[in-house]
């Protein structure tokens, strides 16, 4: 009864440093409360980028100061990460947890490699 999480293998951020991808999970139970976390893995270090808990049927809400936004539809979450720079290029893992009702289930995606290219500065015009 493991929970499978699917996400794209590669995403290219826009020139404005915005990357979007879909995180889809196959729920083994009838969850009413779901937590979605974006993790960044660099070398063997894993850090939390952002997290949001939502009630099924309701909207996904990240904290005001979060670099993430998202929308949810059934077992699918559309995630957007903004403010990315070239140094943020890396593997971004979607983690889904079925929080309520029990039992708890954990689902971890294989990660999305996000490539960020800093835009070239505009040359001064005469």
């Amino acid at each position: 009864k493991a929970m499978h999480v699917a996400q794209p293998a590669v995403v290219l951020a826009s020139s404005r440093g915005i990357a979007s991808f879909v995180c889809e999970y196959a729920s083994p139970g009838k969850a009413t409360e779901v937590r979605v976390t974006v993790l960044r893995q660099a070398d063997s270090q894993v850090t939390e980028v952002c997290a949001a808990t939502y009630m099924m049927g309701n909207e996904l809400t990240f904290l005001d100061d979060s670099i993430c936004t998202g929308t949810s539809s059934g077992n699918q979450v559309n995630l957007t990460i903004q403010g990315l720079r070239a140094m943020d290029t890396g593997l971004y893992i979607c983690k889904v947890e079925l929080m309520y009702p029990p039992p708890y289930y954990l689902g971890i995606g294989n990660g999305t490699q996000i490539y960020v290219i800093d835009p070239e500065p505009c040359p001064d015009s005469d």
Epitope: K1, A2, P28, R35, T37, A51, T53, M99, Y104
Partner: antibody, heavy 118, light 108 residues
Framework: QVQLVESGGGVVQPGRSLRLSCAAS????????IHWVRQAPGKGLEWVAV????????NYADSVKGRFTISRDNSKNKLYLQMNSLRAEDTAVYYC???????????WGQGTLVTVSS | EIVLTQSPGTLSLSPGERATLSCRAS???????LAWYQQKPGQAPRLLIY???SRATGIPDRFSGSGSGTDFTLTISRLEPEDFAVYYC?????????FGPGTKVDIK
């Protein structure tokens, strides 16, 4: 560095109560699920309970459900286990454990011994 | 509840030998959610392997994990004196989070 320090263990009579505490440091406490795992003398490991993130969600082993209550205070980086109606079979070393962001149990406290005996 | 069974219960080997420890689950466990721990007398358990095959920080490469579905293996390629201990497998994909009964690796 990550540290988990348990306290509150001791000898207690069957049917009585005891409250364990765990002081955490070296990490962002509210971003992690924190567990209690116990080990009876000479026996294996048994997961007891977990409290998630803001403390609103908790899960328990069937063996302690209705008798034990796990809680956390994120402002103090502390985890608690309120143990009521204690039985002889609850005698064990109780470990406070951090669930890593990917789910596995990466840091363990040194443990605190609870002995239930008349 | 996922029940984990470990075999053998005790493994008697000499330093330098290879140790193969088995963990079997009562139902399929994603390899992402299977861990191995080492415990020595009087000490807390220590994480060795997570995700069935990833070594935890600071764990020597003589320790390796493998497996999928219901069958998982921990291998110690060449036993060092400090490796004689009890080893537990655990699943952390769903509650209740369960441990195997342990395999004791002792000196022959």
């Amino acid at each position: 560095q990550v540290q988990l320090v348990e306290s509150g263990g001791g000898v207690v009579q069957p049917g009585r109560s005891l409250r364990l505490s765990c002081a955490a440091s070296g990490f962002t406490f509210s971003s992690y699920g924190i567990h209690w795992v116990r080990q009876a003398p000479g026996k294996g490991l048994e997961w007891v309970a977990v409290t998630w993130y803001d403390g609103s969600n908790k899960n328990y082993a069937d063996s302690v459900k209705g008798r034990f209550t796990i809680s956390r205070d994120n402002s103090k980086n502390k985890l608690y286990l309120q143990m009521n109606s204690l039985r002889a079979e609850d005698t064990a070393v109780y470990y406070c454990v951090r669930g890593e962001l990917l789910g596995y149990f990466d840091y363990w406290g040194q443990g605190t011994l609870v002995t239930v005996s008349s | 509840e996922i029940v984990l069974t470990q075999s053998p219960g005790t493994l008697s080997l000499s330093p330098g030998e290879r140790a193969t420890l088995s963990c079997r689950a009562s139902q399929s466990v994603s390899s992402s959610y299977l861990a191995w721990y080492q415990q020595k007398p009087g000490q807390a358990p220590r994480l060795l392997i997570y995700g069935a095959s990833s070594r935890a920080t600071g764990i020597p490469d003589r320790f390796s994990g493998s497996g999928s579905g219901t069958d998982f293996t921990l291998t110690i390629s060449r036993l060092e004196p400090e490796d004689f201990a009890v080893y537990y497998c655990q699943q952390y994909g769903s509650s209740p989070f369960t441990f195997g009964p342990g395999t004791k690796v002792d000196i022959k």
